[in-house]
């Protein structure tokens, strides 16, 4: 049982508009055009978007207007395909446009590039930024929306017309001050940072829709929402989790309109229905639509029910255990992922789904036996290395982060990943780490009960990104194996992997290692960037270099980055000491 | 495993229709979607229509909509796909497809995990 309304309507177009309401529509609209068309610029697509919008509201006045029955894939496909020069700008993705729907709408799913060859959305000066916002907050705003979803194709929608939102109150608040740097940066940083584990994670969402379809989003959902909500029942659950469910799928779709209508109608039905959920909603269930939805998707865990009987009784010891599970297989299974998620809510997502499929396991090979019982009666034990192996990745990851800090960090798993899989290439290899390493900021700060979920999630859905670059050109052997399998055994498959033996050295290019006077003027970020493309390369040249070697070549790097920096004449500090340098690492990696 | 059997396939003029029913059996498995998709000798297998499980939302191909539809019997785990208005150009062998997982893409034929033989249909002029 769903809560979307499922009448028909004459106009699809002319629905969706008065539903979400012209600013919204009008935003959604530029998301998928935007998502879809990545190369496109933002006034090729706000031409567009005007178009259908003035469409839409011809459709609102009659919906037997002329092609107002049209679906919207139909309607949108067909304007993105009476762009000019598509083939020129687009390639292969111009051939979706010989396609019938919905066969086309599928075609340009495919084409969305997870990597588009697009240069940094580099912020403005303050001053140039409260400028063109006084001037026309809806363009600026627009601006918002088509370079951070051109970037980011599968970002979630209607998430991202609320960091739109955020975005503009900031803004507002902002630009009426007398520093307007201090207090921007900060906020729009934490804006930014937030959006930018929002995209991975709804990225991963969309990869489990893709590679293993719904049903595997539902256990997804089903672990996450017991987690939160200890309290509703079983049926409740399935509910959320079905209407979820399809929310994302319209979104991986590209269907963005329903995506957020149908995210609204949910929250909608949440808010009504917070007795039979959750008691912590209210908060949220008091903002407006956007908040409201952002604020109900992070909500805090309800307190758990003080008299829950242990999960040993139902699932172990009740002698109906076989019977239960053949009569309906994926229900029971279903009831087991409940009953273990809302029981602890301080283990991951991945893990829960983990020993649900060790619990399926073990079921299928028992309950074929002569004393099933007997067979079945330790899976509980069973569950104890699955669960201390993530358990003690956090431990080392955090003890780790703690002593060397962020970008210390960042640079350990560098070196990790790159003898793991140094056939990828270096920029990848970086991004991979720098994102890893933020999970020491963003986890390892937390209560010890969240560390677990908030860890192996995020890692789950970085590497998830990692995968998705490496299907494009793949390299190693060991990512392939690791990507191959299913999304919650990535992780510690990824933590499994050793040194890859098969890899040949590369020779070592003194040009590499070769840095000029402009690097003094780089901003911090990317200085760490630079350095950490040096590490990575040194680290392909010798694999097996120690953790001290690697650790005196980046001293040495780093004090000489800073001697020529500091140095009046740079560029001869720096075409002097540099050769140097060169030397002094060969010797100490010999 | 899932058995997927076709039949109503066979030969009609223009303009003609024709029934096809398709009937899963095997496991019990949960059917996300049925689909049907057509394959002329040399070209690639192309989706014709296809219909979801629960919701009975359907998709068809532009070129068949309005003269095509697709319907289920969820207790008799059947399909059909009721062809009406035939013309030449539907004439293919059609397969019709069990998608398991309810994967993201409907036309893709990698999102359907068992198929059926085959029935042909042919529409003379």
């Known amino acids: 049982r769903g809560v979307f309304r499922r009448e028909a309507h004459k106009s699809e177009i002319a629905h969706r508009y008065n539903d979400l309401g012209e600013q919204h529509f009008k935003g959604l609209v530029l998301i998928a055009f935007s998502q879809y068309l990545q190369k496109c610029s933002y006034d090729e697509h706000a031409k567009l978007v005007q178009e259908v919008t003035d469409f839409a509201k011809t459709c609102v006045a009659d919906e037997s207007a002329a092609n107002c029955d049209k679906s919207l894939h139909t309607l949108f496909g067909d304007k993105l395909c009476a762009i000019p020069n598509l083939r020129e700008n687009y390639g292969e993705l111009a051939d979706c446009c010989t396609k019938q729907e919905p066969e086309r709408n599928e075609c340009f799913l495919q084409h969305k590039d997870d990597n588009p060859s697009l240069p940094p959305f580099e912020r403005p000066e303050a001053e140039a930024m409260c400028t063109s916002f006084k001037e026309n907050p809806t363009t600026f705003m627009g601006h918002y929306l088509h370079e951070v979803a051109r970037r980011h194709p599968y970002f979630y929608a209607p998430e991202l017309l609320y960091y739109a939102e955020q975005y503009n109150e900031i803004l507002t608040q902002c630009c009426a001050e007398a520093d307007k740097e201090s207090c921007l940066t900060p906020k729009l940083d934490g804006v930014k940072e937030k959006a930018l584990v929002s995209s991975v994670r709804q990225r991963m969402k969309c990869s489990s829709m893709q590679k293993f379809g719904e049903r595997a989003f539902k256990a997804w959902a089903v672990a996450r929402l017991s987690q939160t909500f200890p309290n509703a029942d079983f049926a409740e659950i399935t509910k959320l989790a079905t209407d979820l469910t399809k929310v994302n799928k319209e979104c991986c779709h590209g269907d963005l309109l329903e995506c957020a209508d149908d995210r609204a109608e949910l929250a909608k039905y949440m808010c009504e229905n917070q007795a039979t959920i959750s008691s912590k909603l209210q908060t949220c269930c008091d903002k407006p639509l956007l908040k409201k939805a952002h604020c109900l998707s992070e909500v805090e865990h309800d307190t758990m029910p003080a008299d829950l009987p242990a999960i040993a009784a139902d699932f172990v010891e009740d002698q109906e255990v076989c019977k239960n599970y053949a009569e309906a297989k994926d229900v029971f299974l279903g009831t087991f992922l409940y009953e273990y998620s809302r029981r602890h809510p301080d283990y991951s997502v991945s893990l829960l789904l983990r020993l649900a499929k060790k619990y399926e396991a073990t079921l299928e090979k028992c309950c074929a036996e002569a004393n099933p019982p007997a067979c079945y009666g330790t899976v509980l034990a069973e569950f104890q290395p699955l669960v201390e192996e993530p358990k003690n990745l956090v431990k080392t990851n955090c003890d780790l982060y703690e002593k060397l800090g962020e970008y210390g960090f960042q640079n350990a798993i560098l070196v990790r990943y790159t003898q793991k899989a140094p056939q990828v290439s270096t920029p990848t290899l970086v991004e991979a780490a720098r994102n890893l390493g933020r999970v020491g900021t963003k986890c390892c700060t937390l209560p010890e009960d969240q560390r677990l979920p908030c860890v192996e999630d995020y890692l789950s859905a970085i590497l998830n990104r990692v995968c998705l670059l490496h299907e494009k050109t793949p390299v190693s052997e060991h990512v392939t194996k690791c990507c191959s399998g299913s999304l919650v055994e990535r992780r510690p498959c990824f933590s499994a992997l050793t040194v890859d033996e098969t890899y040949v050295p590369k020779e070592f290019k003194a040009e590499t290692f070769t840095f000029h006077s402009d690097i003094c003027t780089l901003p911090e970020k990317e200085k760490q960037i630079k350095k950490q493309t040096a590490l990575a390369e040194l680290v392909k040249h010798k694999p097996k270099a120690t953790a001290e070697q690697l650790k005196t070549v980046m001293d040495d790097f780093a004090q000489f980055l800073d001697t020529c920096c500091k140095a009046a004449d740079k560029d001869t500090c720096f075409s002097t000491e540099g050769p140097n340098l060169v030397t002094r690492c060969k010797d100490a990696l010999a | 495993q899932v058995q997927l059997v076709e039949f109503g396939g066979g030969l009609v003029q223009a303009g003609d229709s024709l029934r096809l029913s398709c009937a899963a059996s095997?496991?019990?498995?949960?059917?996300?979607?049925m689909a049907w998709f057509r394959q002329v000798p040399g070209k690639e297998r192309e989706f014709v229509a296809a219909?979801?499980?629960?919701?009975?939302?359907?998709r068809y191909i532009d070129s068949v909509k309005g003269r095509f539809t697709l319907s289920r019997d969820n207790t008799k785990n059947m399909v059909y796909l009721q062809m009406n208005s035939l013309k030449p150009d539907d004439t293919a062998v059609y397969y019709c497809?069990?998608?398991?997982?309810?994967?993201?893409?409907?036309?893709?034929?990698?999102?359907?995990?068992?198929w059926g033989q085959g029935t042909q249909v042919t529409v003379s002029s």
């Open positions: 219909i979801s499980w629960s919701g009975g939302t359907t």
């Open positions: 095997g496991r019990s498995l949960g059917i996300y979607k």
């Open positions: 497809a069990v998608d398991s997982s309810g994967r993201l893409y409907w036309t893709l034929s990698t999102s359907y995990d068992y």
